[in-house]
Interface confidence: low
């Protein structure tokens, strides 16, 4: 039968059942994908826009695929084998009562089964297998794939190869709350904070616990992964993103044409090949660019570097450095510097560190 000819697979939740909280649906689906990624080289990432490989849909009765649902009971869900279009999609009967527990129909357990089909598995004759055609509730906290399930999926995709393991693309708690988590770049965008890492970014709305992870390419398809520095000029609705010796301008959240441009247009000397971090201070209308153990200061009004730079980071930002990964400006008086898994709240008026935090402290970890 068909299989996915790639190891990086996207999914999207088309709509949500009213039976459960949105967050619980997200969690159940994410955990169901994780069951299969744990025993294969497959990587799953949730996207919120654009075409996903696997579309998760809640629908009732006839819903446009010639496989109408039958009301409560009977067929709980169905899924299509790997392929384009409807291929891979998983449909759940909205006439069932979907739950996080043993009452009604457990979404997680059903999703594990349906995703098995989405990946190319047929039904199993082993009653202990999740791919057995009859639904039976088991304790989801101790749920394990049967040997038959694992044999089946690994016959299609092989076993997980440790050296292929990427940073967790589906934003499961261990990744986001991993105490060793570091970021490539961080910037505010209006009342949001974007945290960039590899091909992903986390989105945090100020003063809200909720965050979401997304592919950079799903928001800005023309931008590369691995953004290394970012800063915002909020008054102009502009965000600048840097990778290697190039930068992109985002205006009103839309990429501007005729980019990328060379970072040397800012006035950097030729030996500067990339920017580690950048931050704009609206009080001074200056942008600080951090490169290795030095920083430059750029006058955004006059569009030129200030004289007397570069300077050593350690000399002028007490307790910060010698190098940093990311930085952003907040609350009209703080820079937040990121160094590996540590973060420093720095009061630029007092010119000292006022707090030491973990890099992922913004996520309620």
């Amino acid at each position: 039968g068909p299989v996915w000819r790639k190891h990086y697979i996207t999914y999207r939740i088309n709509n949500y059942t009213p039976d459960m909280n949105r967050e619980d649906v997200d969690y159940a689906i994410r955990k169901a994908f994780q069951v299969w990624s744990n025993v294969t080289p497959l990587k799953f990432s949730k996207i919120n826009t654009g075409m996903a490989d696997i579309l998760v849909v809640f629908a009732r009765g006839a819903h446009g695929d010639f496989h109408a649902f039958d009301g409560k009971g009977g067929i709980l869900a169905h899924a299509f084998g790997p392929g384009s279009g409807i291929g891979g999609d998983a449909h759940f009967d909205e006439d069932e009562f979907w739950t996080t527990h043993s009452g009604g129909t457990n979404l997680f357990l059903t999703a594990v089964h349906e995703i098995g089909h989405s990946l190319g598995l047929g039904h199993s004759s082993d009653p202990k297998a999740v791919m057995f055609p009859t639904y039976k509730y088991v304790d989801i906290n101790t749920f394990r794939l049967s040997a038959d399930d694992i044999r089946g999926i690994q016959s299609l995709y092989g076993d997980p190869k440790e050296n292929q393991r990427l940073p967790n693309p589906d934003n499961s708690e261990p990744a986001l709350c991993d105490p060793n988590l570091s970021f490539d770049a961080v910037t505010t965008v209006g009342n949001k904070i974007f945290f960039f890492k590899d091909r992903f970014f986390w989105l945090k709305v100020s003063e809200r616990p909720k965050t979401s992870v997304n592919l950079i390419s799903s928001l800005w398809p023309t931008l590369p992964s691995g953004i290394e520095a970012a800063y915002e000029i909020e008054a102009r609705n502009q965000v600048f993103l840097f990778k290697d010796d190039k930068y992109w301008l985002i205006s009103n959240l839309r990429p501007e044409p005729n980019y990328p441009k060379s970072i040397h247009s800012f006035g950097f000397p030729n030996f500067v090949k990339k920017i580690d971090a950048a931050v704009f201070n609206p009080r001074f209308y200056r942008t600080y660019f951090f490169v290795d153990n030095q920083y430059w200061r750029y006058d955004e009004r006059r569009q030129m570097m200030d004289p007397g730079y570069p300077k050593l980071i350690t000399k002028n930002f007490q307790g910060i450095g010698p190098k940093i990964d990311a930085v952003f400006y907040s609350k009209n008086k703080y820079y937040y510097f990121f160094q590996g898994s540590n973060q420093f709240e720095y009061d630029f008026l007092l010119q000292r560190i006022t707090k030491t935090l973990k890099s992922n402290s913004w996520f309620g970890c």
């Epitope: 826009t49 009342n191 949001k192 709305v205 997304n214 959240l253």
Partner: antibody, heavy 125, light 108 residues
């Protein structure tokens, strides 16, 4: 050119029914959530109903819940509003509007970026 | 439900003057848009996500604010800016969407 054109308005008696249509052109209709918004004579804007791009989830203001039904036919690029048990207070200009915004960020913001010219519904005996 | 209150109800100004329109939410919101409506016309999106100008909107329009207090500023009124302005917020889950009562900017 991106365009929305409402039709189906008219004079109807209290308790009667009307079906409004909104024909979309110039954009990929099936990719956008759509809304109906109304404006009573001399009054402000009131959101009436919304529908997801797929036609799946639908949403209603409390004032019309149980009486109005929003639907869409993506193959015809058309949005509908079926209005039953009409009351005098439903008298208004009804606009259909395209929901813009990055769907990716939809938990965070949302706006109506394209509006039709409106169709007038008068409920009177 | 979140209530949106706009003030003043009417603003009488001359062309070239600065207009400051206020919108207050009964609870904290972070997804605010502003619309302009000319007499007999459909509304037009001006500002979304508090401060982002919609496509084709002149730079004299700007939005600001956070939490419960938001402002639309027109730096120097042009004749075509005399209209009614509405703010609008949306909660996504469960979906609820409310407009403010509007502010009419009229020629003094």
């Amino acid at each position: 050119e991106v365009q929305l054109l409402e039709s189906g308005g008219g004079l109807v008696q209290p308790g009667g029914s009307l079906r409004l249509s909104c024909a979309a052109s110039g954009f990929t209709f099936s990719a956008y959530e759509m809304d109906w918004v109304r404006q009573a004579p001399g009054k402000g804007l009131e959101w009436v109903s919304g529908i997801s791009s797929s036609g799946g989830p639908t949403y209603y203001a409390d004032s019309v819940k149980g009486r109005f039904t929003i639907s869409r036919d993506n193959s015809k690029n058309t949005l509908y509003l079926q209005m039953n048990s009409l009351r005098a207070e439903d008298t208004a200009v009804y606009y259909c509007a395209r929901v813009g915004g990055w769907e990716l960020l939809q938990d965070y913001y949302y706006y109506m970026d394209v509006w039709g010219k409106g169709t007038t519904v008068t409920v009177s005996s | 439900d979140i209530q949106m209150t706009q003030s003043p109800a009417t603003l009488s100004l001359s062309p070239g003057e600065r207009a400051t329109l206020s919108c207050r939410a009964s609870h904290s919101v972070d997804n605010l848009a502003w619309y302009q409506q000319q007499p007999g016309q459909a509304p037009r999106l001006l500002i979304y996500d508090v401060s982002y100008r919609a496509t084709g909107i002149p730079a004299r329009f700007s939005g600001s604010g956070s939490g419960t207090d938001f402002t639309l500023t027109i730096s120097s009124l042009e004749p075509e800016d005399f209209a009614v302005y509405y703010c609008q917020q949306r909660n996504n889950w469960p979906l609820s969407l409310t407009f403010g009562g509007g502010t009419k900017v009229e020629i003094k």
